[in-house]
């Protein structure tokens, strides 16, 4: 059809609407005439592409016609008004509604003018993150999971972390037809420094004004790691009592500590307080090592420290070890 | 087929009232647009107004504004053209055409065969 | 007061291409303008040919063909026949009234 002249009449409209699901929406259609164009406009008919017949016409004479009555609606159209307005309603937004519909009006003496719509439904998904708790495997596995459902079209996922790693994402269908829950897991080699940090989910849908990002705290189950602080190879004789301490990471938290020497039994000047191992002042030379043996849910682990107390005084008064 | 067939041949004096009929058949009267045409004795084709037979809705030519009226009688599938205030210029074969649509347009389909209109005192 | 001019008369032999033009004194015609082309037999009713620039009505030959030709618009007789002598009206739309061209005399000789 000839592009249209400077004082044509223009019918107006959206290239796409979009809708929800099960809602209704309105397709806006309307005729734009210039200021001195006399046209009159005898009907207003939408069609759908692919499919004869119309699905929805208003007659200057004789009103509407629809082909689903309860699903179809003019919303301004009238008799005995003029015709400039041919929006339709739709109800019950079903996923075969999606396509491309025709807003034509036939006027005088200007003749039939239309225009295409494109009608989207989508479907607003649900979104859930949550952490997969995995142990030392050694191997990549998922260590959280962010599941977005029943969107129309399928939800974007993708994944913001520090820790390295790769998402897997997949697809299938939900629980409403023509929606599709996507399903994505971030996959990586567990390690204790993994064990509380955090990825973020970012998940994108043309229904959402901005992305949404949903937090995962991540939980990776390792055995203790172990080590001794509190000595610092120098402690004298006839100084303050020092304290060792036990220091475990480990998840779950450590159920419980146990000090020995590699002689076994602790000697008396050493005492025993949970994660601490107390030093008294001793009147002799020592060279202990000593073991702190840790345990959690997923095992024991143990540290070892050689502590030597030496003779010559120190310069200042001090502790064996600052505490 | 479509027809238009309009009323005979009138004789009237300056400052009085004539009244032409189309009648329409062959086709959905209702739906139409009908215009009204005539031509002056050695004079070209002037164009009247136009009538939406379902409603009555009616667009005129300004040079005749106040002095025409355009009906129709949907019972009958009659259309009337009513000029006024008659003068010797508007001595003239007076026509009506129905539109029909080619393609997404319209066009001038198909004409009644005339009506005389002298004006003479 | 727009004008739409037509050329008086023209003359085509049989089986010949003639092109009747139609101007505007407003400007270039345009397909704003709804160009219409009317057909009137001696002793016939007139019967409409062209319609909205270019679109044939229903029954016409396809010898006959609408367009715009530059600034005007044009109907164009492609193998002209001896029923086809009669006169040719020209009817343009301007924002609210349709004007008729003068006509033109086409001959086939």
């Known amino acids: 059809w000839p592009p249209p002249g400077t004082g044509d009449i223009i019918v107006q409209a959206p290239t796409q609407v979009p809708g929800f699901l099960g809602d209704s929406v309105t397709l806006p259609c309307y005729l734009q005439v210039p200021g001195m164009e006399e046209t009159h406009v005898s009907q207003l008919t939408w069609s759908r592409h692919g499919e004869s017949g119309s699905m929805a016409v208003f007659h200057q004479t004789q009103g509407p016609n629809y082909s689903e009555p309860k699903r179809l609606e003019f919303v301004a159209a009238r008799l005995g008004t003029e015709l400039r307005d041919a929006s339709l309603r739709m109800f019950g937004l079903r996923v075969e509604d999606e396509g491309n519909y025709t807003c034509l009006f036939v006027t005088f003496p200007q003749g039939s003018r239309s225009v295409d719509i494109w009608l989207r439904v989508l479907a607003k998904p649900q979104n859930t993150a949550e952490v997969q708790k995995v142990q030392l495997t050694g191997k990549p596995v998922p260590v959280a999971r962010c599941v977005s459902t029943g969107g129309r079209p399928p939800a974007h996922i993708t994944w913001h972390s520090d820790l390295g790693g790769m998402p897997n994402t997949s697809q299938a269908p939900g629980f409403l037809s023509g929606t599709v829950t996507v399903t994505s897991l971030w996959i990586l080699v567990p390690s204790s420094q993994v064990d509380g940090k955090s990825v973020t989910c970012k998940v994108e849908h043309e229904s959402f004004e901005k992305p949404q990002l949903l937090t995962v705290n991540l939980t990776v189950y390792y055995p203790p790691e172990v080590s001794i602080s509190g000595y610092d190879n120098n402690w004298y004789l006839s100084q303050n009592e020092a304290t060792l301490t036990c220091d475990a990471r480990s998840n779950p938290e450590p159920t419980g500590y146990n000090w020995s020497t590699t002689m076994g039994p602790l000697p008396p000047f050493a005492v025993a307080q949970g994660a601490q191992l107390l030093i008294r002042p001793v009147d002799k030379p020592i060279n202990t090592t000593f073991i702190c043996n840790v345990t959690n849910a997923l095992g024991a682990r143990q540290a070892e420290l050689t502590v030597q107390v030496k003779e010559g005084p120190p310069s200042e008064p001090s502790g064996m070890s600052s505490n | 087929q479509v027809q238009l067939v309009q009323s005979g041949a009138e004789v009237k004096k300056p400052g009085a009232s004539v009244k032409v009929s189309c009648k329409a058949s062959?086709?959905?009267?209702?739906?139409?647009?009908i215009s009204w045409v005539r031509q002056a004795p050695g004079q070209g084709l002037e164009w009247i107004a136009w009538?939406?037979?379902?409603?009555?809705?009616?667009n005129y030519n300004q040079k005749f504004t106040g002095r025409v009226t355009m009906t129709t009688d949907t019972s009958t599938s009659t259309a009337y053209m009513e000029l006024r205030s008659l003068r010797s210029d508007d001595t003239a074969v007076y026509y009506c055409?129905?539109?029909?649509?080619?393609?997404?347009?319209?066009?001038?389909?198909?004409w009644g065969q005339g009506t005389t209109v002298t004006v003479s005192s | 007061q727009a004008v739409v001019t037509q050329e008086p008369s023209l003359t085509v032999s049989p089986g010949g291409t003639v092109t009747l033009t139609c101007r505007s004194s407003t400007g270039a015609v345009t397909t704003s303008n709804l160009a219409n082309w009317v057909q009137q037999k001696p002793g016939q009713a007139f019967r409409g040919l062209i319609g909205h620039t270019n679109n044939r009505a229903p029954g016409v030959p396809a010898r006959f063909s609408g367009s715009l030709l530059g600034d005007k618009a044009a109907l164009t007789l492609s193998g002209a026949q001896p029923e086809d002598e009669a006169e040719y009206y020209c009817?343009?739309?301007?924002?609210?009234?349709?004007?008729f061209g003068g006509g033109t005399k086409l001959t086939v000789l």
């Open positions: 062959g086709y959905t009267f209702t739906s139409s647009y």
């Open positions: 009538i939406y037979a379902g409603t009555g809705d009616t």
């Open positions: 009817i343009l739309w301007y924002s609210n009234k349709f004007v």
């Open positions: 055409a129905r539109h029909g649509m080619t393609g997404r347009g319209w066009y001038f389909a198909v």
